[in-house]
Interface confidence: low
């Protein structure tokens, strides 16, 4: 009857990048299925991923409603073939997730250099503003819209002929740097939220882009 042979989920883990947020857990089900519930700490539980045989559940739609809220999730285990109408009153085993605050904890996705333009001894480097699934007034917001000045970019640049790197920072999506005339430079950017004190304060570096390739434009 009820949940006799089901086991509770474990290793509940939030995987979140640029607010795309998935809850993962173990074990791979054998003769059981899962239902996930998510809640803000002051709200009601909402069920998602009903009776799934997966060990992950995309909760993005819930967390983007308020990325500064703190969320909890729990994963219930049911026997395979379970339907609500079976009339079982037995509590299914469940496990709670760690708490998750998207604004503080979502990982920053790898940024992309959109373009760079050289004018004399100046180069303007533009970072592509990534779109997120966070909405305001039915409009999707960019990473910059969400984080505002909390988000900065660090530019690493170096002469193609040398390994010595220089850095620049901006709290917009553009850099204006000085370069030596006649030299080719390579660029890589990293997204950073300086106010974070955890491992997720920086993104991975963008792919390297070098002058003399298609993204660049040169004007005297």
């Amino acid at each position: 009857s009820g949940t006799t042979n089901t086991v509770a989920a474990y290793n509940l883990t939030w995987k979140s990048t640029n607010f795309k947020t998935i809850l993962e857990w173990e074990p791979k089900p054998i003769n059981q299925v899962y239902t996930v519930q998510i809640s803000t700490k002051s709200g009601d539980w909402k069920s998602k991923c009903f009776y799934t045989a997966d060990t992950e559940c995309d909760l993005t739609d819930e967390i983007v409603k308020d990325v500064k809220q703190t969320y909890l999730a729990r994963v219930f285990s049911y026997p395979a073939g379970h339907v609500e109408s079976t009339g079982s009153t037995e509590e299914p085993p469940y496990e709670n997730s760690p708490e998750f605050t998207p604004y503080l904890e979502t990982n920053l996705g790898q940024p992309t250099i959109q373009s760079f333009e050289q004018v004399g001894t100046k180069v303007n480097v533009t970072v592509q503003d990534e779109w997120t699934l966070v909405r305001r007034n039915d409009t999707f917001l960019s990473l910059r819209d969400v984080f505002g000045k909390d988000l900065i970019y660090t530019l690493y640049y170096w002469k193609s002929s040398s390994s010595g790197k220089k850095t620049a920072k901006t709290n917009t999506n553009e850099f204006l740097i000085d370069v030596d005339k006649g030299e080719n430079y390579c660029f890589s950017v990293q997204a950073v939220i300086p106010s974070r004190r955890t491992a997720n304060r920086k993104s991975t570096d963008s792919p390297v882009e070098c002058m003399g390739h298609e993204k660049g434009e040169s004007r005297e």
């Epitope: 509770a8 290793n11 809640s39 700490k41 002051s42 539980w45 509590e91 496990e95 709670n96 760690p98 708490e99 998750f100 904890e105 955890t198």
Partner: antibody, heavy 117, light 112 residues
Amino acid sequence: QVQVVESGGGLVKPGGSLRLSCAASGFSISSYDMSWIRQAPGKGLEWIGIIGSNGRTYYADSVKGRFTISRNTNENTVYLQMNSLRAEDTAVYYCARGLYDGTGNIWGQGTLVTVSS
Amino acid sequence: ELVMTQSPPTLSLSPGERVTLSCRASQSVYGNNWLSWYQQKPGQAPRLLIYGASKLATSIPARFSGSGSGTQFTLTISSLQPEDFAVYYCQGTYYSGDWYFAFGQGTKVEIK
């Protein structure tokens, strides 16, 4: 074997400081919420504070500003730094894993802290 | 802040009797069910009996059961055994921008 072991208790003068340690084995503290609870002689249990699996800390009003919980995930150890100690802080101090709703709940045997001149 | 109130403070009973302990929260515990019961014997650390208001912890005998929701909770021992004489604590969880955890003052179950 999954267990937690507290250490660092002893006699300290009022106004003094003490750091308690909670060494965990058989599991990773970075995956669990770890709490400190105390029990004064002949009294009930009192929750002191918690460090979440994400490293966030919360404290009881009675110790806010005086006590600090931290952790070293490499050493798999949780700490309770106690400053400005008072006589009423005399108690057995317990470290426990998983207090949110009891799942995965494990308690140590406690360490006695005596605050007296 | 969350305050947990247990009643009665002391119960004098004989083995075999049915025991009902009460715990009241000053406001609804988180999720209406984040309420645990612990047993503590002299010189020992507390031992978890019930979590989630009604779920039996690992290796706890089935004579222990929990019920309730929101602010009112009950621990029942269907038939008191000699090893059950101890102090019982309820512990609730509350959230209001910060987490709060609070224990009741305890109910001592002693031999009559």
